[in-house]
Amino acid sequence: MMTGTIETTGNISAEKGGSIILQCHLSSTTAQVTQVNWEQQDQLLAICNADLGWHISPSFKDRVAPGPGLGLTLQSLTVNDTGEYFCIYHTYPDGTYTGRIFLEVLESSVAEHGARFQIP
């Protein structure tokens, strides 16, 4: 039975050219996290494997930095980075937990961070 929940940074916004941290946290479970995948729509951004560490996809290697923790830092943001991002926690024995973050990249300096919320 899957008892865990994923807490994410929720809906966030950032300025074009800036950077943003995508963060998820898995709680309320004793399951072992074997791997965390970060994806944008159907594109793989990065993987953090419990045994092998961080792996950044080739197409994002110049703009994505691992961390902090199991989070992901996106750099040199463009308007095209606007969209949904998913943290996918692969755990044993529970299975897979997925969290969603919506990022809006703004042209001007009106960007501000959204509230945190939970996805069961």
Epitope: Q35, L44, I47, D51, P58, K61, Y92
Partner: antibody, heavy 123, light 109 residues
């Protein structure tokens, strides 16, 4: 679909270094999801994993061979290579390169293989 | 390391018969990390099954995998002439390192 092809000397002298290269065609080894591995098979025996490498150069090795093994990658040539030092007759085997799905989790396996190349260690 | 013991070493059967191959691990293996391969003489191994029970692309449905923990099975429901080969199981953990079983030869009776 990626295809893999091993190349290198078929004969190596004892105490020397065995060097093999695997060239990928039909696809790039710059993949976010896959490592690229080496497996060997002595004549008439079973399979032994040697080690694997990610496009960025991250590696993981079989501990029993780690002290003698170096695996490297050259993304500009779409190749990865194996070096095995201080070889003996026991290293005589068919050497295969393969795509390693270790990051694919529920699909962990070697799903694409080269045809293999026979390497004999003899003086 | 995790030792995979395959049995029997050799299986003598006729075309059309059912083949049941066993792979036993020295310690528990996640079913997600268990694969089966077929190897014919002079050829590279070919992936048949990953995740203990999922068929790889292009593999006929007469091949099926099952099991969990320390006991895994590859079943060939009706042997075709091209199925006579050596079969290997493999576990794909990182720590302890990945290993292959010693193989089962399926030969024509």
């Amino acid at each position: 679909q990626v295809q893999l092809q091993e190349s290198g000397p078929g004969l190596v002298k004892p105490s020397q270094t065995l060097s093999l290269t695997c060239t990928a065609s039909g696809g790039s080894i710059e993949s976010g999801l896959y490592y690229w591995g080496w497996i060997r098979q002595p004549p008439g025996k079973g399979l032994e994993w040697i080690g694997s490498i990610y496009y960025s150069g991250s590696t993981y090795y079989n501990p029993s061979l780690k002290s003698r093994v170096t695996i490297s990658v050259d993304t500009s040539k779409n190749q990865f290579s194996l070096k095995l030092s201080s070889v003996t007759a026991a290293d005589t085997a068919v050497y295969y390169c393969a795509r390693d799905g270790v990051l694919a989790l529920n699909k962990r396996s070697f799903d694409i293989w080269g045809q293999g190349t026979m390497v004999t260690v003899s003086s | 390391e995790i030792v995979l013991t395959q049995s029997p070493g050799t299986l003598s059967l006729s075309p059309g018969e059912r083949a049941t191959l066993s792979c036993r691990a020295s310690q528990s293996v996640s079913s997600s990390y268990l694969a089966w391969y077929q190897q014919k003489p002079g050829q590279a191994p070919r992936l048949l099954i990953y995740g203990a029970s999922s068929r790889a692309t292009g593999i006929p449905d007469r091949f099926s995998g099952s099991g969990s923990g320390t006991d895994f099975t590859l079943t060939i429901s009706r042997l075709e002439p091209e199925d006579f080969a050596v079969y290997y199981c493999q576990q794909h953990t990182v720590r302890p390192p990945l290993t292959f079983g010693g193989g089962t030869k399926v030969e024509i009776k």
